[in-house]
Amino acid sequence: MMTGTIETTGNISAEKGGSIILQCHLSSTTAQVTQVNWEQQDQLLAICNADLGWHISPSFKDRVAPGPGLGLTLQSLTVNDTGEYFCIYHTYPDGTYTGRIFLEVLESSVAEHGARFQIP
């Protein structure tokens, strides 16, 4: 029985050109995390394997950095990065847990709305 839950950073609104950190945390289970995949729609961004470490997809190498922890840092954000991101935890013996984060990347001019943009 899968007892675990995934907590995420929550949805994020950020400014074009900035950076953000996507993070998930698996709790309430003693299952062993064997691998974490980060995906956007149907694209694989990165893999963190318990034995082999990090692999960043070649098409994202220049804008995606591993960490902190099992999280992912997206840099030089573009409006095209707007979308839903998935952290997929492969665990033993539980199976797969998935967390979802929606990222909205806005043109700088939208700052007049008074939104607080996230640029760490």
Epitope: G10, S13, Q23, T82, E84, F102, E104, H113
Partner: antibody, heavy 119, light 112 residues
Framework: EVQLQQSGPELVRPGGSMKISCKAS????????MNWVKQSHGQNLEWIGL????????SYNQKFQGKATLTVDKSSSTAYMELLSLTSEDSAVFYC????????????WGQGTSVTVSS | DVVMTQTPLSLPVSFGDQVSISCRSS???????????LSWYLHKPGQSPQLLIY???NRFSGVPDRFSGSGSGTDFTLKISTIKPEDLGMYYC?????????FGGGTKLEIK
Amino acid sequence: EVQLQQSGPELVRPGGSMKISCKASGYSFTGYTMNWVKQSHGQNLEWIGLIIPYNGGSSYNQKFQGKATLTVDKSSSTAYMELLSLTSEDSAVFYCARGLRGYFAMDYWGQGTSVTVSS
Amino acid sequence: DVVMTQTPLSLPVSFGDQVSISCRSSQNLTNSYGNTYLSWYLHKPGQSPQLLIYGISNRFSGVPDRFSGSGSGTDFTLKISTIKPEDLGMYYCLQGTHQPWTFGGGTKLEIK
């Protein structure tokens, strides 16, 4: 003036499918997400999902995955929601609503489309 | 999914009254960057829902200042300082911090 004009009421047979349209005007269609909301029994509101006209990406409430399919036609500034394998549980009023940039809220709403599933 | 609990379900009022509607979430609605995506809507019979408040306390364009929002974390409140006839209807809170977005069950503001 921002306006979202939805298609008219629909009567559909159980097992059938249908597509609701939402034509946007008065703003840059690709600059905002488009959300869809279900109102059943004249009360409960449920978020179905959203679509990003700029890149075609989408996000669904898993409850509606396989039930609703969201698409856009950028050339006509129109968003669509197709509803599949309809049952009486799908009888409701469906709204499209523009996303408020930077705040994960909905600022302008269509007038609603009533869908009745009945044989 | 995040559960949004609104109280009361029904709120009988007289015109001129001040009222508060509460909305509680099953999870913290502040994201890792300190932003909280909580909004309030009014749905009048025969009309579409309308945005009143976004980001906890920001009044949307054209919304009278008798409407105010407050709260943090998991506890949020909508206050209406002087009830007018056009304020009657169903009020809903919505959280947009976690996927999927979820609405509260609604509070019906009706005349006593």
